[in-house]
């Protein structure tokens, strides 16, 4: 007999997330209108495809990076998609509501569409440590909660700092691996005997986790340069993130079979190196000169990539209860820190060259943007660990971790799954 | 040569809208972000607004928020301000002005710096009853 | 916003004099400062962008300096075609440009 939600969720899980929507309907029907200025459509289907590679990143990307798991990559995929599908209304109000608001009703183009798929995304990243313990009503509260500080998080940024949108949007590496491994903190750790099977990663879900780190690794210089002001800064950060990348593969692959005694290349190390480079260079991917600059940095994260992929986990796994296969939260933890002090490193090297106190300045202001982002997403992030503990959610037990059969209905139940 | 000409400009009653064209030649226009600057009679420049190169990005000044809409037809070449809402504070000469992104860099980093290097010569916006 | 506060609002010269002009940024913008020269009827134009950097097309007489919140603008020998306005306009923070004053350079 195929397995069911219990009886409370099936009850609570449609009514909250029906609801929730019924609401944001609401809040567009009075608070919202669509952009009703002249653009010529051969633009607008340019920008608009900046957006689409945003999504197929959100969607495919991130969707199938975390379906790896043995017994859940349905739910992975799945899940991901509601989150993105929830999180990216909210994110739209939201950025409307703290950005336009005092002057009316909130105008939705295609940047703000753009502005949100980005928001989004940080969820898909910090969810990859909690995937497999948690349901979807947990999961709509954790979309929640975290769009809502990525959005003031980002809005005090650019108040206080003067940050432009591209700067103050990455960040959301450093945010989102922090946000998910305090919420990850919060859940509770041992996986019963019994179920240490089901976060094991088998071959076709690994070969999807893969298509996913494809999609990622393809699309990571339109993320990259998506918020970008000019055509020759969007030129440089694509250029860049792209070096970037190539050479973390290359390190990546080569790396893991450098970390295995036996020369073998882990699939886990992979799937999430190939991206080091991206996340490494996204803060500082237009002021970068020269392809080495960015292919040295390409390295090196692809090296800190593979060593925390081989050095982490045991650690992830004792304190947070991180599965082995989940790996991304710690990896942008680590990149996100990365490209944070690489642009601090430019502004210190600017203070040296210009002999200029003011510069000085500037390198602790960012200091403190990155302090902020870091402290926000850990206060954030057990907010919403201590909310997804309250029994009114009816989490999964520990003993259905990890286990598309508590979510999913199966025609035909074969246990091996 | 690259040019800017502006223009509907006119008198208008409070509360009414107008619409500023601005007609760009002589350069790539889908490649240059574009600003409507202002100055009322007898005061200094007033930033209005900016639109981005590919008119995904637009921002106001604090002043105009939720009255003025700035948009741009790169396939026509031309930059629109349409003012709602028209005040008596509104009366101003209304210029465009192209915006050059200066790119220079060093052996470790870029730099990026944007001005308004080319003008219009304005088109007059006057708010009377 | 950033406030640019200029200073003097209006000053008086005679020809081939050494004239400065001072903008003064209410936090840090580091160079992105740029000058205009505005003559009434005109349109503006743009004299030093970055702080420092001529325009080109610009005379060397004029000349740009300063970085973070202090910035001066310099006309080394004033020429009769200079008498005109100038203004400061910081381009730090793309959200909400500011132009400073202004300062109306007039004939003694």
């Known amino acids: 007999m195929s397995s069911k939600y219990p009886r409370s969720v099936r009850r609570c899980l449609p009514l909250w997330a029906l609801t929730l929507e019924a609401a944001l309907i609401l809040l567009f029907y009075f608070f919202t209108h669509y952009d009703a200025s002249l653009e010529d459509q051969k633009g607008l289907v340019a920008s608009y495809q900046v957006g689409q590679d945003l999504t197929v990143m959100a969607a495919i990307g991130l969707g199938f990076l975390t379906s790896s798991f043995r017994r859940h990559s349905w739910s992975s995929v799945a899940f991901n998609l509601f989150m993105l599908a929830l999180g990216v209304q909210w994110a739209i109000l939201l950025d409307g509501f703290l950005s336009q608001f005092p002057s009316g009703k909130v105008v939705i183009t295609l940047f703000s569409i753009r502005l949100a798929t980005m928001s989004a995304l940080s969820v898909l990243i910090s969810v990859d440590a909690v995937l497999g313990k948690v349901n979807l009503a947990q999961l709509v509260v954790m979309v929640l909660v975290e769009v809502t500080a990525l959005g003031n998080l980002r809005m005090v940024i650019s108040n206080i700092f003067n940050t432009d949108y591209h700067m103050n949007m990455m960040h959301i590496y450093v945010f989102a691996a922090y946000f998910g491994l305090s919420v990850a903190w919060c859940l509770p750790k041992p996986l019963p005997e019994g179920t240490e099977d089901k976060d094991q990663t088998a071959t076709i879900p690994s070969l999807s986790a893969m298509l996913g780190a494809l999609f990622l690794w393809m699309f990571w210089p339109s993320f990259n340069s998506a918020l970008l002001r000019s055509p020759i800064e969007r030129k440089n950060a694509v250029f860049n993130t792209y070096y970037a990348v190539a050479v973390s593969v290359v390190t990546a692959i080569s790396g893991s079979s450098l970390a295995h005694p036996q020369g073998k290349i882990s699939k886990t190390y992979v799937h999430s190196a190939v991206l080091a480079g991206g996340v490494a260079v996204g803060t500082s991917c237009h002021l970068i000169p020269s392809p080495w600059l960015a292919m040295v940095l390409g390295l090196v994260a692809g090296l800190i990539s593979v060593g925390g992929a081989k050095y982490l986990p045991g650690c992830c796994n004792r304190v947070l209860g991180i599965p082995h296969s989940s790996i991304m939260g710690y990896n942008f933890s680590l990149l996100g820190l990365l490209g944070e002090i690489i642009y601090i490193v430019l502004l210190v090297l600017d203070t040296v060259g210009a002999g200029n106190g003011m510069i000085g300045f500037q390198v602790l202001l960012s200091i403190g943007e990155l302090s902020l982002a870091i402290v926000i997403a850990l206060m954030s992030g057990l907010l919403t660990g201590l909310l997804l503990n309250l029994k009114i959610w009816k989490a999964p037990h520990e003993a259905k971790y990890f286990d598309d059969q508590v979510f999913w209905k199966f025609p035909h139940l074969a246990v091996g799954f | 040569q690259v040019q800017l000409v502006e223009s509907g400009g006119g008198v208008v009653q409070p509360g009414r809208s107008l619409r500023l064209s601005c007609a760009a030649s002589?350069?790539?226009?889908?490649?240059?972000?574009m600003h409507w600057v202002r100055q009322a009679p007898g005061k200094g420049l007033e930033w209005v607004a900016i639109?981005?190169?590919?008119?995904?990005?637009?921002y106001y000044a604090d002043s105009v928020k939720g009255r003025f809409t700035i948009s741009r037809d790169n396939s026509k070449n031309t930059l629109y301000l349409q003012i709602n809402s028209l005040r008596a504070e509104d009366t101003a000469v209304y210029y465009c002005?192209?915006?050059?992104?200066?790119?220079?860099?060093?052996?470790?980093?870029?730099?990026?710096?944007?001005?308004?290097?080319?003008w219009g010569q304005g088109t007059t916006v006057t708010v009377s009853s | 916003d950033i406030q640019m506060t200029q200073s003097p609002s209006s000053l008086s010269a005679s020809v081939g004099d050494r004239v400065t002009i001072t903008c003064r940024a209410s936090?840090?913008?580091?160079?992105?400062l740029n000058w205009y020269q505005k003559k009434p009827g005109k349109a503006p134009k743009l004299l030093i962008y970055?702080?420092?950097s001529l325009q080109s097309g610009v005379p060397s007489r004029f000349s740009g300096s300063g970085s973070g919140t202090d910035f001066t603008l310099t006309i080394s020998s004033l020429q009769p075609e200079d008498f005109a306005t100038y203004y400061c306009?910081?381009?730090?923070?793309?959200?909400?440009?500011?132009f400073g004053g202004g300062t109306k350079v007039e004939i003694k």
């Open positions: 639109i981005w190169f590919d008119g995904s990005n637009k």
């Open positions: 002005a192209k915006e050059h992104g200066y790119y220079s860099s060093s052996w470790y980093r870029n730099y990026y710096y944007y001005a308004m290097d080319v």
């Open positions: 306009q910081q381009s730090y923070r793309t959200q909400g440009l500011t």
């Open positions: 002589g350069f790539t226009f889908s490649s240059y972000g």
């Open positions: 936090q840090s913008i580091r160079r992105y």
């Open positions: 970055a702080a420092s």
